[in-house]
Interface confidence: low
């Protein structure tokens, strides 16, 4: 999906209002210094591409972040403020139903959410000029 036509301001507002709190809740008890941020992004659409990938694409050691509250809110936000996003995600949603239920919050999932927090911060920081 091409994120260049999203309403970045509205996404920022949704992130600050709800998604950020859910991400921080998920990370509760973990210090941000516990993980090195290895994923970065060079512009706002690129940040959203990386955020989508980390949030919704299962990895071998963290299969089901997409079921978490922050992921559901992220999906709703992207669907709301990125034209045509919902349509591109129909197949992804069907595939998601087949994924196994998360048993425990593994260290790899915590690391992935730490990366997500970093990407969101980068996304927000590129919007500072709008304030």
């Amino acid at each position: 999906y091409d994120f260049t036509n999203c309403d970045f301001q509205k996404i920022e507002a949704d992130y600050l209002r709800t998604i950020s709190k859910d991400l921080i809740t998920y990370m509760s008890g973990t210090k941000s210094t516990d993980f090195n941020n290895t994923v970065s992004c060079s512009n706002r659409p690129h940040c959203l591409t990386e955020i989508q990938s980390l949030t919704f694409n299962p990895t071998p050691r963290c299969a089901s972040l997409a079921k978490e509250m922050f992921a559901r809110k992220t999906k709703a936000t992207l669907a709301l403020w990125c034209p045509g996003y919902s349509e591109t995600q129909i197949n992804a949603t069907q595939a998601m139903k087949k994924r196994r239920k998360r048993k425990v919050t593994t260290n790899k999932c915590l690391e992935q959410v730490s990366q997500l927090l970093g990407l969101w911060r980068r996304f927000i920081r590129t919007l500072l000029k709008k304030q």
């Epitope: 091409d2 260049t4 036509n5 060079s42 512009n43 706002r44 659409p45 590129t126 500072l128 000029k129």
Partner: antibody
Framework: QVQLVQSGAEVKKPGASVKVSCKAS????????MHWVKQAPGQGLEWIGV????????TYNQKFKGKATLTVDTSTSTAYMELSSLRSEDTAVYYC??????????WGQGTLVTVSS | DIQMTQSPSSLSASVGDRVTITCRAS??????LAWYQQKPGKSPKLLVY???TLAAGVPSRFSGSGSGTDFTLTISSLQPEDFATYYC?????????FGQGTKVEIK
Amino acid sequence: QVQLVQSGAEVKKPGASVKVSCKASGYTFTSYWMHWVKQAPGQGLEWIGVIDPYDTDTTYNQKFKGKATLTVDTSTSTAYMELSSLRSEDTAVYYCTRSLDGFFDYWGQGTLVTVSS
Amino acid sequence: DIQMTQSPSSLSASVGDRVTITCRASENIYSYLAWYQQKPGKSPKLLVYFAKTLAAGVPSRFSGSGSGTDFTLTISSLQPEDFATYYCQHHYDTPWTFGQGTKVEIK
């Protein structure tokens, strides 16, 4: 208003180094990436590299690794590019330019670096 | 690296003409394309970004279109101040690269 003001023209001998400055004003320096672009006489534009003033993270065009070094001084909102081991093919106008999304909305006036023995 | 190829490399046109410059990327860059205008001895000036978004203060006679690999900059009615060199640049990912430029000259 946004301004990027670069240092003046330089004439250097082959093998020497040169440090070009770019003073930013009219915006929050740490909120934008700062890029450097080369334009050789009569030629097109070539991206050298980028520095994020927020955390000094740098990314270079492979071609300019070892040639260009990018730094910033956030206390003075100034970006620097040092070119080392100068050769005649480094003769060019060098621009600093800022970006949020990889396109360049404001540019410095350019600094001509001439390498001549 | 992504290669950007502009055509034509130069063109002659008259005031009032409709001018079209094309830019082709060596791979899919979605809408991550910018256009710049440069006059002799001056810095480049941003005209268009995200393929079709006009930069602030740019006259509406300029327009951008395209996505994927093929892009176009159109000047609907060429004005005397539009004679310059135009560059495309992808802003998909590093390294950012420019086209070789298209010089628009007076016929």
